[in-house]
Interface confidence: medium
Amino acid sequence: DLNKVFPPEVAVFEPSEAEISHTQKATLVCLATGFFPDHVELSWWVNGKEVHSGVSTDPQPLKEQPALNDSRYCLSSRLRVSATFWQNPRNHFRCQVQFYGLSENDEWTQDRAKPVTQIVSAEAWGRADCGFTSVSYQQGVLSATILYEILLGKATLYAVLVSALVLMAMVKRKDF
C-alpha cells in the first residue's frame, strides 16, 4: 500500500442500570477506534438481522487527536431498545464495522491497488435485571424446570396418597 493502514478496534458497551430504571429504555454504545484512513461503515445487527430503527451514528468519524495531521479516527453509534428487550438474555446484539483499505499483503500498483473490505465486529447478549448472563439464564431455566417437575411429582404423589386414604376410609365406612 502507498500509505499505512490501521483497521479499527470495535467494542460494545452495555446500557446502564440507571438508564433502564429511569427511562425503561436501554442504549447500547458501539465504539470503533484507532482506524486510518477514515473510510468505514457501521451497522447494528440484532439476532442476525440488520436494524435501522433506534440507531444513531456519528455523521462522520472524528480524529482521535485533532491537533495531529495524521491522527487515527474513531466513530461511535448508539442503538436504543426497550428495557424489556435488552433484559431478555436470548437477544443477541452485534455492532459491525466495515473498513475499506488495503490489506497488509496487497501490493499498491501504478493503476491503484484494489481496496479490500475488512469486517470487525463486537457483540453483547441481553442481560436480565438480576444479573443473568445468557448461560446462567439457560441454567436457571433448566433448574426451574427440574424444580417444577419435582414439585409437580410431589403434588401428584400427595394427591394419589390422599385419594387412596379417602377411598380406604369410604370402604371402611361401608363395612360398618
Partner: antibody
Framework: QVQLVESGGGVVQPGRSLRLSCAAS????????MHWVRQAPGKGLEWVAV????????YYADSVKGRFTISRDNSKNTLYLQMNSLRAEDTAVYYC?????????????WGQGTLVTVSS | DIVMTQTPHSLSVTPGQPASISCKSS???????????LYWYLQKPGQPPQLLIY???NRFSGVPDRFSGSGSGTDFTLKISRVEAEDVGVYYC????????FGQGTKVDIK
C-alpha cells in the same frame, strides 16, 4: 508543526548527478507515501516520483525513469531523490510532498522547493 | 497516459464576482472503489502549491467555503463564488487514478 524542507539543489553540468533531500517533521513520516514534484521555470507542475510508506513500492514519470531514484530513510524522517544523467530539461524547482493518506492521491503538505539548474 | 486539459488558460476577475475553471480528462477518473480521483490545487505567487479540493468536491481543511468542486467521469469544474484578492495565482487540476498528471494550469488575477 507539519513541515517539509528540501535541500541539495544547485547548478550542475549535463550528464552529472545530484542528490536532493527532504527532511520531514510534525507527522508520522513512516506512515505516508511521499512524492517529488517539479516545476520548470515559468511552467506548470510535473509529478516526478512516488515511494510507499515502507519503501517497498516506487514509481516514476516516464521522463525520469531509469535516471532518477527515489528512496527514504524512515529512521531519519528523510526522503531522497538521486538524479543521474541530468539534462537541461531537468532544470526546475523540485518539491517534496506528503501524500494525503488513505488510498493515496492528493499531496496535502509541500516543501518550499529547491532549485536545480542543469547548464554547461 | 491520462491527459488533463484546463480551460481557460487565464482569467481576470472583479473582486466579489464568481469564477469558474473547467478541467477535462482523457479518460474517466472514476475508480472501482466508487471514488473519483480528481484534485484541485492553487499555487499563489512565489509559493508552493496548496491542496484545495480532493476527490472532486471535498474541501481540504482550512479552505474557505467559497471554493467548490463538482463534476464526474471526465468533466470537472472548480468554482469560486466570490473572488477575493488572496485567490490570485495558478489553479491546477490533477488526476491520480493512473499515477499522477496535472492540468496545464489556469492563471487567475484581479481586474
Amino acid at each position: 508543526q507539519v513541515q517539509l524542507v528540501e535541500s541539495g539543489g544547485g547548478v550542475v553540468q549535463p550528464g552529472r548527478s545530484l542528490r536532493l533531500s527532504c527532511a520531514a517533521s510534525g507527522f508520522t513520516f513512516s506512515s505516508y507515501g511521499m512524492h517529488w514534484v517539479r516545476q520548470a521555470p515559468g511552467k506548470g507542475l510535473e509529478w516526478v516520483a512516488v515511494i510507499s510508506y515502507d519503501g517497498s513500492n516506487k514509481y516514476y514519470a516516464d521522463s525520469v525513469k531509469g535516471r532518477f531514484t527515489i528512496s527514504r530513510d524512515n529512521s531519519k524522517n528523510t526522503l531522497y531523490l538521486q538524479m543521474n544523467s541530468l539534462r537541461a530539461e531537468d532544470t526546475a524547482v523540485y518539491y517534496c510532498a506528503k501524500d494525503l493518506g488513505g488510498s493515496g492521491g492528493a499531496f496535502d503538505i509541500w516543501g518550499q522547493g529547491t532549485l536545480v539548474t542543469v547548464s554547461s | 497516459d491520462i491527459v488533463m486539459t484546463q480551460t481557460p488558460h487565464s482569467l481576470s476577475v472583479t473582486p466579489g464576482q464568481p469564477a469558474s475553471i473547467s478541467c477535462k480528462s482523457s479518460q474517466s477518473l472514476l475508480y472501482s472503489d466508487g471514488k473519483t480521483y480528481l484534485y484541485w490545487y492553487l499555487q499563489k505567487p512565489g509559493q508552493p502549491p496548496q491542496l484545495l479540493i480532493y476527490e472532486v468536491s471535498n474541501r481540504f481543511s482550512g479552505v474557505p467555503d467559497r471554493f467548490s468542486g463538482s463534476g464526474s467521469g471526465t468533466d470537472f469544474t472548480l468554482k469560486i463564488s466570490r473572488v477575493e484578492a488572496e485567490d490570485v495565482g495558478v489553479y491546477y487540476c490533477m488526476q491520480s487514478i493512473q499515477l499522477y498528471t496535472f492540468g496545464q494550469g489556469t492563471k487567475v488575477d484581479i481586474k
